[in-house]
């Protein structure tokens, strides 16, 4: 058993059939010594008197708030929550696995840039009794800080016949230096609590792994007269690290007809225009990518070609 | 060319070879993603290799103010990654095969450490420690992880030349 | 919790050969290369040996022909044997190891040691 | 080899003072790279194996109180005790593990004046 927060615990249970459990004593927060009883949740029936109560912890049913009582008036509470192992195995109930980039993938990162900050999410089908805590730090042995948000709902989604939600959080680290080699990866770590069931879900990264640039902006099209061609040209986006000259992106153009099948013309350029033959109906895309460091390329860029 | 404790480097020759390390580094191992190194084991080895950090001086205000504390640590880094890729943990079994890219990158290593410090100049005698013996089945986690540090080593590298090639040529 | 020990005969004859075995337990010895140091009475300490995570070895020079450091991986044992002993081979030997890394690392954990006296 | 030459042999420093141990090698043990010196320190009581106190020259191994520290470069190292505690009287060493084979100092001998 561990203090998750004041008067909050939560007991580590080997879930399997006939279980043995884990005994728990629990103290009430008094300086009284006589006449103290204990119930459970919202139960009237008298689980045990004196100033500790010993209980074995199986399920559910053994979890809750216990609280301990003197001639009706209440001394204080200890909710005990349960962290189910099953065959060795932490239990990962509460969250949906994204499967991406590879199975157990719970939390998902991303950084617009180098500064230090960055967004996480996860999915959950979970409408009710839910709760995050989220902590971060650069390494785990002499610990950075990150400070980390509130964790909100920042999506719902019908998936099939089930809702989906999606919470998200955003993180920054306390002293980053965007210019230096990260050694120590960031290590993020969620708390998840749904009714009287704990997990915890981890992740750890470098921020120039889950770097993703938001899309180009200003993306033009200039014609070029007596030609087919149209000079492209798009500019940075304002979230990227500055200045340029050291933050450098890589572009990639596509000229896309209507039609899906259509074959796509590429061209790789690290300059900020291209010269691209725009076809009837077609449509001109810019994505982003670090030029130096192959992280995730940017959503596209789109215009049309008319 | 780069004189210690003096002129500049050939910034743009440099930013050229280090743009082209960076190639070489993800086309030695591209599928970086796809194998996640901190189940592995992986806190030895990332601390047993360079890093470029906060106060080398490699931000863009540092190189402003003295580009050669940055190009030293660079130059450092540079000739331990030579060492490392000219080791048996890449020169032995499980042999690489006849196209890969090792053989170019470390050729590219050894010759931006030249470009920063041609002949006849030294900020010092670069030391590395006797190599832990490696046997076939740990050489390709150490190559991976190796590659892998490398290419974080190198975009630094190739930001630092970049900006230079941009804003501190003559 | 890593732990070694040290086991093997207080005393060997002069000629002979000595040999210990160390028994590491509460760790993966994947990980870990494991050394044996030794130290003569009211003396300093001198390496012998290292035995390294994939199996092969390294000995100090002046040790050389006459040590063997060999494991038995199903066991978790390690084994120490030097040969035509002489009384200048009367230490405490301890067996150590050290983190796999790319380079050889610090003894982090020692066994208690035995005490070997050569002596007719 | 590389010779590991520790001083002074030996130290009587009172309850309280400081206590300082040099050990100097033969060759540098800073890899310029990593910037890391190969290098630790041990503390040895009667009858006990050595216990690592200091590695990479100056972090200092979890557990060992924080009068413990370790500072120096390249050829010269040095272990300082802040304020000298009954229980650490002992004898020191000092190891590298830059090059084979291990080499240690030869002891200093630390006692209460």
């Known amino acids: 058993i561990w203090e998750l927060k004041k008067d909050v615990y939560v007991v580590e249970l080997d879930w399997y059939p006939d279980a043995p459990g884990e005994m728990v004593v629990l103290t009430c927060d008094t300086p009284e010594e006589d006449g103290i009883t204990w119930t459970l949740d919202q139960s009237s029936e008298v689980l045990g008197s004196g100033k500790t109560l010993t209980i074995q912890v199986k399920e559910f049913g053994d979890a809750g708030q216990y609280t301990c009582h003197k001639g009706g008036e209440v001394l204080s509470h200890s909710l005990l929550l349960l962290h189910k192992k099953e065959d060795g195995i932490w239990s990962t109930d509460i969250l949906k696995d994204q499967k991406e980039p590879k199975n157990k993938t719970f939390l998902r990162c991303e950084a617009k840039n180098y500064s230090g900050r960055f967004t996480c999410w996860w999915l959950t089908t979970i409408s009710t009794d839910l709760t995050f805590s989220v902590k971060s730090s650069r390494g785990s042995s002499d610990p950075q800080g990150v400070t980390c948000g509130a964790a909100t709902l920042s999506a719902e989604r019908v998936r099939g016949d089930n809702k989906e939600y999606e919470y998200s959080v955003e993180c920054q680290e306390d002293s980053a230096c965007p210019a230096a080699e990260e050694s120590l990866p960031i290590e993020v770590m969620v708390d998840a609590v749904h009714k009287l069931k704990y997990e915890n879900y981890t992740s750890s990264f470098f921020i120039r792994d889950i770097i993703k640039p938001d899309p180009p902006k200003n993306l033009q099209l200039k014609p070029l007269k007596n030609s087919r061609q149209v000079e492209v040209s798009w500019e940075y986006p304002d979230t990227w690290s500055t200045p340029h000259s050291y933050f450098s992106l890589t572009f990639c153009v596509q000229v896309q007809g209507k039609s899906k099948r259509e074959k796509k013309d590429r061209v790789f350029t690290d300059k900020t225009s291209a010269t691209v033959i725009c076809r009837k109906n077609a449509s001109i895309s810019v994505r982003a990518q670090d030029r130096y460091y192959s992280s995730s390329w940017s959503e596209w860029a789109s215009v049309p070609c008319s | 060319r780069a004189v210690p404790g003096g002129s500049s480097p050939a910034w743009t020759q440099c930013q050229q070879l280090s743009q082209k390390l960076c190639t070489l580094a993800w086309s030695a191992h591209p599928l970086v993603g796809h194998m996640d190194l901190r189940e592995e084991g992986d806190e030895e080895t990332t601390n047993d290799v360079p890093h470029i950090q906060c106060g080398d001086g490699c931000d863009p205000q540092g190189l402003r103010d003295n580009s050669q504390f940055c190009l030293q640590r660079i130059h450092q880094g540079l000739i331990f990654y030579e060492k490392l890729l000219g080791s048996d943990i890449f020169t032995g079994e499980p042999s690489l095969l006849p196209d890969s890219p090792v053989g170019q990158l470390h050729a590219s290593l050894l010759g931006l450490s030249q470009l920063l410090q041609p002949e006849g100049h030294h900020w010092e005698t670069q030391q590395i420690p006797s190599l832990s013996p490696s046997q076939p089945w740990q050489r390709l986690l150490l190559r991976f992880k190796i590659l892998r540090s490398l290419q974080a080593f190198v975009a630094v590298a190739a930001r630092v030349f970049a900006h230079g090639a941009a804003t501190l040529s003559p | 919790q890593v732990q070694l020990q040290e086991s093997g005969p207080g005393l060997v004859k002069p000629s002979e050969t000595l040999s210990l075995t160390c028994t590491v337990s509460?760790?993966?010895?994947?990980?870990?290369?494991v050394h044996w140091i030794r130290q003569p009475p009211g003396k300093g300490l001198e390496w012998i040996g290292v035995i390294w995570t994939g199996g092969s070895t390294d000995y100090n020079p002046s040790l050389k022909s006459r040590v063997t450091i060999s494991r038995d991986t199903s066991k978790n044992q390690f084994s120490l044997k030097l040969s035509s002993v002489t009384a200048a081979d009367t230490a405490v030997y301890y067996c150590?190891?050290?983190?796999?890394?790319?380079?050889?690392?610090?003894?982090?954990?020692w066994g208690q040691g035995t005490l070997v006296t050569v002596s007719s | 080899d590389i010779v590991m030459t520790q001083s002074p042999d030996s130290l009587a420093v009172s309850l309280g003072e400081r206590a300082t141990i040099n050990c100097k090698p033969s060759?540098?043990?800073?890899?310029?790279?990593?910037?890391?010196?190969?290098l630790a320190w041990y503390q040895q009581k009667p009858g006990q194996p050595p216990k690592l106190l200091i590695y990479y020259a100056s972090t200092r191994q979890s557990g060992v109180p924080d009068r413990f520290s370790g500072s120096g470069s390249g050829t010269d190292f040095t272990l300082t005790i802040s304020s000298l505690q009954a229980e650490d009287v002992a004898v020191y060493y000092c190891l590298q593990h830059f090059n084979y084979p291990w080499t240690f100092g030869q002891g200093t001998k630390l006692e209460i004046k």
């Open positions: 150590a190891r050290d983190k796999y890394g790319l380079f050889p690392g610090y003894f982090d954990y």
């Open positions: 060759q540098s043990l800073l890899s310029s790279g990593n910037r890391k010196n190969y």
């Open positions: 509460g760790g993966s010895l994947s990980s870990y290369n």
